[in-house]
């Protein structure tokens, strides 16, 4: 056998080169046949009615042909025949790679609520071979479940991702990325998560600046409530008591002028949106005016709450004053 060929892998729409090579040439006729055994080239002549085949080189030692705009139907065995005595035959296999036609990502819900599990699907249509789909949430790779559907030698891959969303996922891209031998570089599509979550409430003491409340002083608290959608209602209440007569409420701000001991207690900022409610408590302790002889020690007390809490502890250990937990967020 002195007739040689090489297998060819080509991307759909591109050019395949088929070469029939003869080691010891002797003027014998070289012929190239397609998978249906129809003659494409007889020497340097193309009887086949397919002008996508063009002669690149013809000599006694080589018949080299290009096939442009390759399609999936061109795949198969191409036969080189050398009419020696006896005749010789060798075949080359053309494998056609088809990149996915399009990549579609579909999220079950446009807007999800924190803690909810949502389904995200990504479909890579009509590729050959089947596409590998990878999932990312931001930079973190996640595991999906793929199903492959075959139709006429082409593969459609659908990957399903079940994703439990958290408030931190809001605005984070969910990326569907494909890996395929016909695709160079990154072929991906993404959707940004929109996650609704209940408010996070935080109380900030804006006055007095040193954080110590004494009789006769003023107190200003600001309630910061962040949620999605933005909380529609922010209210101040005094737990287990009436709000002092001299307290002034202005939106998220609570002002109490001329503090006295009767103002001691827990002040609660409540915020709500369509997802839920949350609150944060501020425990006010009004101290005596400063004295000349300071007590030698300071004490810290801790309050336990019934929900998960973020504690902001504001303490002052200056002589003659008692520090306390000032705010508890719920």
């Amino acid at each position: 056998q002195n007739l040689f060929t090489k297998d060819v892998t080509v991307i759909e729409g591109e050019v395949a080169t088929i070469s029939c090579q003869v080691n010891k040439s002797d003027d014998s006729v070289i012929q190239l046949l397609n998978p249906n055994r129809q003659t494409i080239y007889f020497r340097d002549f193309r009887p086949l009615k397919d002008s996508r085949f063009q002669l690149l080189n013809f000599s006694s030692s080589e018949l080299k042909v290009s096939l442009t705009n390759v399609s999936i139907s061109d795949e198969g065995r191409y036969f080189c025949q050398l009419y020696t005595d006896p005749p010789q035959e060798s075949y080359t296999t053309i494998t056609v790679l088809v990149p996915p036609r399009n990549l579609m990502i579909d999220i079950q819900k446009d807007t999800a609520v924190e803690g909810e599990e949502i389904e995200v699907n990504c479909t890579a249509m009509a590729s050959k071979p089947a596409t590998t789909i990878r999932w990312f949430k931001g930079n973190t790779e996640l595991k999906g479940k793929s199903e492959v559907e075959e139709w006429s030698d082409m593969y459609t891959v659908t990957s399903q991702l079940m994703l439990k969303v958290h408030k931190e996922d809001d605005g984070v891209p969910v990326i569907c990325q494909v890996e395929h031998p016909a695709v160079t570089g990154n072929l991906q599509t993404q959707r940004y998560l929109e996650v609704q979550y209940k408010p996070q409430v935080h109380i900030q003491m804006t006055y007095p600046l040193q954080g110590l409340t004494r009789e006769g002083d003023a107190l200003e608290l600001t309630c910061e409530a962040i949620g999605k959608p933005q909380p529609v209602m922010v209210t101040w209440v005094r737990v287990d008591d009436e709000m002092p007569q001299h307290a002034v409420l202005s939106g998220p701000n609570l002002f109490i002028n001329n503090l006295n001991k009767t103002d001691n207690g827990t002040y609660r900022c409540e915020a709500s949106n369509i997802v839920g409610k949350a609150h944060s408590d501020y425990m006010l302790y009004v101290y005596d005016p400063p004295t000349t002889i300071p007590p030698p020690t300071t004490t810290t007390t801790t309050t336990t709450t019934t929900t998960t809490t973020i504690l902001t502890i504001i303490t002052d250990s200056r002589a003659g004053e008692e520090g306390s937990i000032r705010a508890v967020d719920h």
Epitope: D27, S28, V29, N36, R37, Q38, T39, F42, F45, R46, P47, L48, K49, S51, L82, Y83, T84, D85, P86, P87
Partner: antibody
Framework: EVQLVESGGGLIQPGGSLRLSCAAS????????MSWVRQAPGKGLEWVSV???????YYADSVKGRFTISRDNSKNTLYLQMNSLRAEDTAVYYC?????????WGKGTTVTVSS | SSELTQDPAVSVASGQTVRITCQGD??????PSWYQQKPRQAPVLVFF???NRPSGIPDRFSGSASGNTASLTIAGAQAEDDADYYC???????????FGGGTKVTVL
């Protein structure tokens, strides 16, 4: 000059045998596909047989088993051995270079099968 | 075994264009070759393949093919084009060759 010259035709009785020759000049018979084509009086062209450069041979159904195509490379000559001749084999026999396209033809030799 | 079908005869005024057709299953895949034969002469190849005209053949001879039909066109026929014309092709994938029945072209 590229040329083909047939010979060997004549009058032959039904059942008889005849060998046609086709001498080539200007090219090598063994490196080419060589065909025999015939034309009955007042009729069209009919392909008879082919020999490929590698030596493979093929025949029209009407002559299969009766005719044999061959060549002598040293003489650069093509042959058609015709046995069991019938009246319907009466024709002008042409040898030609090629199959997909026959670009060189001889002038032909006449074979008449008659009693 | 398939066959190639040609119109038996066609006439054309000198200087006019004439088209000779050839029909057959093998022509779905292959281009035919076309031969001109004048009385008491051997056939002569005038056109073959997609667009091949042998040297010495005038450029008024051209070929085309679509589906299972191929055509030989003589644009501006001359008196010397008065002859029989044959199409030829391979018989499918078999190592047999076909000729059409021939078309007699008369140049008036």
């Amino acid at each position: 000059e590229v040329q083909l010259v047939e010979s060997g035709g004549g009058l032959i009785q039904p059942g008889g045998s005849l060998r046609l020759s086709c001498a080539a000049s200007g090219f090598t018979v063994s490196s080419n596909y060589m065909s025999w084509v015939r034309q009955a009086p007042g009729k069209g062209l009919e392909w008879v047989s082919v020999i490929y450069s590698g030596g493979s041979t093929y025949y029209a159904d009407s002559v299969k088993g009766r005719f044999t195509i061959s060549r002598d490379n040293s003489k650069n000559t093509l042959y058609l051995q015709m046995n069991s001749l019938r009246a319907e084999d009466t024709a002008v026999y042409y040898c030609a270079r090629g199959t997909w396209y026959m670009d060189v033809w001889g002038k032909g030799t006449t074979v008449t099968v008659s009693s | 075994s398939s066959e190639l079908t040609q119109d038996p005869a066609v006439s054309v005024a000198s200087g006019q264009t004439v088209r000779i057709t050839c029909q057959g299953d093998s022509l779905r895949h292959y281009y035919p070759s076309w031969y001109q034969q004048k009385p008491r002469q051997a056939p002569v190849l005038v056109f073959f393949g997609e667009n091949n005209r042998p040297s010495g053949i005038p450029d008024r001879f051209s070929g085309s093919a679509s589906g299972n039909t191929a055509s030989l066109t003589i644009a501006g026929a001359q008196a010397e084009d008065d002859a029989d014309y044959y199409c030829s092709s391979r018989d499918g994938n078999d190592d047999r060759w076909l000729f059409g029945g021939g078309t007699k072209v008369t140049v008036l």
